[in-house]
Amino acid sequence: RQQWELQGDRRCQSQLERANLRPCEQHLMQKIQRDEDSYGRDPYSPSQDPYSPSQDPDRRDPYSPSPYDRRGAGSSQHQERCCNELNEFENNQRCMCEALQQIMENQSDRLQGRQQEQQFKRELRNLPQQCGLRAPQRCDLEVESGGRDRY
């Protein structure tokens, strides 16, 4: 079992090294910045989003409230690429968690304040599901300055 876990860890490590998680980071940062912008708006002003999908609200992908966000070509492309990258971890939930942790660590310095960090974490947890993938059951996304014992 120990040998198998060692092999699994090595496989995961090489997978993580090959992965390009930047699109996930870009997608999430854009998403939380967009959300902050929309929270800052007057809720009663009828602003029309020029990029919002012109389709029935109930015509949606399974697994998610609104995974295919067409609010901007760059944004949806980041999401598409991110989902493709995460799909490579679909058969290894432990490694999927490692990938999510890596995204969290890479962006932690750019998050301003506790509220933005919590929001980023929340979106990050939802990310696999938004891609139509299984989310890891237990995945600690806390970032500690002194590093973290992951398992």
Partner: antibody, heavy 113, light 102 residues
Amino acid sequence: ESGPGLVKPSETLSLTCTVSGDSIRSYYWSWIRQPAGKGLEWVGRIFTTGSTTYNPSLKSRVTMSVDMSKNQISLNLSSVTAADTAVYYCARDQTLGRRMDVWGQGTTVTVSS
Amino acid sequence: QSPSSVSASVGDRVTITCRASQDISSWLAWYQQKPGKAPKLLIYTASSLQSGVPSRFSGSGSGTDFTLTISSLQPEDFATYYCQQGNSFPRTFGQGTKVEIK
């Protein structure tokens, strides 16, 4: 897609799909074929890290590869027979929505001596 | 996929069905193909309209039974339509439905 239009039986069919404009990075790329007057058959797909998934019916004969520097995806099909005569398409294959949203124009391959 | 062909006139409502051999959730896409051309994605995840596709095309269904509807057939819609499951590998396509001019 590009490659020789005529391949002899028992030889290897080699096709290349060159993606213009956007980078192929972080996308899956599928190969699909269609014999004249028939339906579509999925051959397999490759991710830009090189990981592949092949159709079991062709697995023993198929090899796919990717060249990020040239923005190219390649398909090799060995030991071809007349049954491999078809139009071959490459398509961008998305995890989000599990759809093939961008297709190449296709290239006709005839297997004949 | 049924029917294998359908004859219709411009302005008609056309319905094509696709039945999966097992539950595929909503992982179904629809493509349109014209002679000598590559397939074009119309609908994905059973009911989501691909960007740039006219709203006269719609999809519905989940599990094993799916439908593609063209609400008012236009001259450019005469083509062959394929469904494709994205639930598992290998990806598989329906045998196609040819929409012909009556």
